[in-house]
């Protein structure tokens, strides 16, 4: 093999361990990580890179081809027996596309000094690394106290002679940073100081944190901070069709990665999350809220025609209260309640039910009662009014009972027990009810109230009447008590089944009170108030018919 | 009673128009999908085209696309078909038929049907 | 678009007896649990009437001597006992995506 010490004599002469370090080290170079944005990789650039040695008698550039023979640009430089070395290699104007942080990665080999014979004395084992800022493109300046050290660059691994005849070629990978950034660009500028060094590579990348689609949120890719512990917080956009109660922010990170979520988009009602989109819900399916993660069937009676549907309509004849959630099924009318039974007693009417055998579909099912009363004879009901009571109410029973009191007696009443649910009033349908016909009981009749005297005589009276407002059953007699004014003690009763009497054996020119009271089945009524009707004198004509008061 | 009533058909000539209606009668109209099925002489039966209640969507089948429009006025209960540049191939029977209540939806009540015929 | 084929394309069967008539999708008609697969019934002159929707639910009104069954891509239009009355055509078609295609129909004969 071709001498090391060729390298030193022959300075634009490529050394063999060059073409065989890079024979080996390209085919491990590895596709940058979707978080690194290349500004510059030596690697790619197919081209003159545009790099300047100063010295010229330096660095130099060594054209070699990969396996595809593309090139490859090496510089090299190898001056390690000459004392004072100081060679620089300027790299082109690099934008930094708005990065404030970037980051170097150079691969390298480098000579370990003891393998030199008789170059100890001047033989390094490091390289120095320099950036200048610049906004203008042609500023490339060799003034040397204008460039910013970023590091002094050593090898972790060096090669021997040895490793040269095994063809094992030790590449070395050195990342550093450089922030904050404060111009359009920069140069970088490599300073080799007595070193033996190949440059095979210069990446140059800044760290971004790359788009994203998360929780429902597009994050735009984003250029990480200048401090190295900076955490950026970025605003997401929530996807097309959907929506958000708390903006979606990530963080991202100095490394490139998102951090720290907070809040979330969510699909908007009408549309559900698919693959990381929002989804139309199609017919039959509905979604009534953001907040609920998929489109659902439509509940029970009910249906949707249209994409996108938030609710759906209620089949014919089916409702839905406002209040009933969107999920709800539709629900109908209850049926009338059925096995309807009433219980008699007196002027009250117990009435008894099963529930409807269709209840709608609903848990809210009462029941109303309507009270009417019926003329026998001429077949005319009418409301009963407000005297009758109904214990415990007349409308919303949740029970399957009640009682009527305070009624007529020997009245014949019909009831209907009509069952209602919460979309009763919403139905333009008929009611639905059963009927109850009874009649009460008779009862004791009311006082007679209407009294019209007839003819007065010196020794009689006649008096008629009508017949009590509220017979509460049929009369079968009338009682007629009377007595002379003062004489209270000393009653007569008369009895009749007509509407009027005459009272004889009267003394003339006196004052008789009369009370009457009806009788029923059910026993007496109380007594009318009192009437006072006076006997004609001795000679008096009989007076005649007229109402008293 | 559900009915839905086609009208409109009728002799046309090979690149000519013609618009069919349908009228709905017994269900709320405006809230039912509607499509339009034809059936040429002897054949079987081809789907043409859908709308929903609220015209927010509507699907065409690939051989009428660009050229038959779909449409419906809620007000009249009515749908309709505008035909254009029809083609020999477009006779048939054309009937609209009413998207069901119950899941998944069939096409549950038809109409009688009206005859569109395209000859020279 | 989802082609459906019916088989077969004609059939006698005496009364009384059981029809089969089968329809095969070109791609799957099912979403979500439900098979998005109907089934109707045209006689000469006449509107088509649905029989079976959902591959198997019967439609309010028809006879129960028919029925639907199958999912996916697979299904059968059954008549348990054939009546006179039953001669027709039959069309399955799917409504799981547009357009809506039917099949080219299966004439039903009595024997």
């Known amino acids: 093999p071709a001498s090391l010490a060729g390298c030193y004599s022959a300075p634009r002469r490529a050394p063999l361990w060059t073409c065989l370090l890079l024979c080996a080290a390209l085919r491990t170079l590895l596709a940058s990580p979707s978080n690194e944005v290349n500004l510059l990789d030596s690697r790619t650039v197919m081209g003159d890179l545009g790099w300047i040695a100063f010295p010229k008698n330096g660095w130099e550039e060594i054209g070699e081809v990969d396996e595809n023979y593309a090139p490859i640009h090496t510089y090299q430089v190898c001056k390690v027996m000459e004392q004072n070395q100081n060679n620089w290699l300027l790299t082109s104007w690099i934008s930094n596309e708005g990065a404030s942080r970037i980051f170097i990665e150079l691969k390298f080999t480098l000579r370990d000094c003891n393998s030199l014979p008789g170059g100890l004395g001047t033989c390094k084992e490091t390289f120095n690394m320099y950036y200048f800022e610049s906004d203008d493109q042609n500023g490339r300046n060799i003034k040397e106290n204008q460039y910013i050290k970023i590091d002094t660059i050593a090898a972790d691994e060096s090669f021997t002679e040895l490793d040269l005849g095994d063809r094992v070629m030790k590449l070395n990978t050195e990342v550093r940073d450089v922030g904050p950034l404060s111009k359009k660009g920069f140069y970088l500028a490599f300073q080799d100081v007595g070193a033996c060094i190949a440059l095979v590579s210069v990446r140059v990348y800044y760290k971004k944190c790359p788009s994203v689609v998360r929780h429902l949120a597009v994050f735009p890719d984003t250029i990480t901070g200048a401090d190295s512990s900076q955490l950026l917080e970025v605003s997401g956009s929530c996807v097309n069709h959907s929506v958000t109660d708390e903006p979606p922010k990530m963080h991202c990170s100095a490394e490139g990665e998102w951090l720290v979520p907070i809040g979330k988009c969510m699909c908007k009602a009408g549309y559900e999350e698919k693959n990381g989109t929002c989804q139309v819900c199609r017919p039959g399916f509905f979604k009534a809220s953001p907040h609920i993660q998929s489109c659902g069937k439509c509940p029970p009676h009910s249906y949707t025609h249209e994409e996108a549907s938030t609710s759906c309509v209620c089949e014919k004849d089916y409702f839905r209260r406002e209040s009933d959630p969107p999920t709800m099924a539709c629900t109908r009318p209850p049926s009338a309640p059925r096995n309807a039974i009433s219980n008699v007693n007196e002027t009250s009417v117990f009435l008894e039910w099963i529930p409807p055998a269709d209840t709608g579909g609903r848990k809210d099912v009462s029941y109303y009662i309507a009270c009417k009363k019926c003329n026998s004879h001429a077949g005319v009901c009418e409301e009963c009014g407000g005297h009758v009571r109904y214990l415990p109410r007349q409308s919303g029973l949740k029970n399957t009972s009640v009682m009527m009191v305070d009624l007529l007696a020997h009245t014949n009443y019909t009831f209907e027990i009509e069952a209602v649910n919460g979309v009763s009033d919403l139905s333009p349908g008929a009611r639905q009810y059963v009927s109850v016909n009874v009649t009460t009981n008779q009862a004791a009749p009311s006082p007679v109230t209407n009294v019209k005297k007839g003819k007065i005589a010196k020794n009689s009276i006649s008096l008629s009447w009508q017949e009590p407002d509220r017979p509460n059953g049929i009369i079968l007699e009338y009682e007629i008590k009377y007595f002379e004014k003062d004489q209270e003690t000393s009653y007569t009763i008369i009895k009749s089944k007509e509407t009027t009497i005459t009272a004889e054996g009267l003394k003339p020119a006196s004052v008789y009170v009369f009370q009457i009271r009806a009788r029923t089945a059910a026993g007496y009524g109380v007594f009318s108030r009192r009437f006072e009707f006076e006997t004609t004198p001795v000679f008096a004509a009989s007076s005649d018919q007229s109402q008293i008061p | 009673e559900v009915q839905l009533v086609e009208s409109g058909g009728g002799l046309v000539q090979p690149g000519g128009s013609l618009k069919l209606s349908c009228a709905a009668s017994?269900?709320?109209?405006?809230?039912?999908?509607i499509h339009w099925v034809r059936q040429a002489p002897g054949k079987g039966l081809e789907w043409v085209a859908s709308?929903?209640?609220?015209?927010?969507?509507?699907y065409y089948a690939d051989s009428v696309k660009g050229r038959f429009t779909i449409s419906r006025d809620n007000s009249k209960n009515t749908l309709y078909l505008q035909m254009n540049s029809l083609r020999a191939e477009d006779t048939a029977v054309y009937y609209c038929a009413r998207y069901g209540t119950s899941f998944p939806y069939g096409l549950d009540y038809w109409g009688q049907g009206t005859l569109v015929t395209v000859s020279s | 678009d989802i082609v459906m084929t019916q088989s077969p394309d004609s059939l006698a069967v005496s009364l009384g007896e059981r029809a089969t008539i089968n329809c095969k999708s070109s791609?799957?008609?099912?979403?979500?649990?439900?098979?998005?697969m109907n089934w109707y019934q045209q006689k000469p002159g006449k509107a088509p009437k649905l029989l079976i929707y959902?591959?198997?639910n019967l439609e309010s009104g028809i006879p129960d001597r028919f029925s639907g069954s199958g999912s996916g891509t697979d299904f059968t239009l059954t008549i348990s006992r054939l009546e006179p009355e039953d001669a027709a055509s039959y069309y399955c078609q799917q409504s799981n995506e547009d357009p809506f295609t039917f099949g080219q129909g299966t004439k039903l004969e009595i024997k």
């Open positions: 791609q799957s008609v099912d979403y979500d649990g439900d098979s998005y």
């Open positions: 017994g269900f709320t109209f405006s809230t039912f999908g």
């Open positions: 959902g591959a198997s």
């Open positions: 709308i929903s209640g609220a015209s927010t969507t509507i």
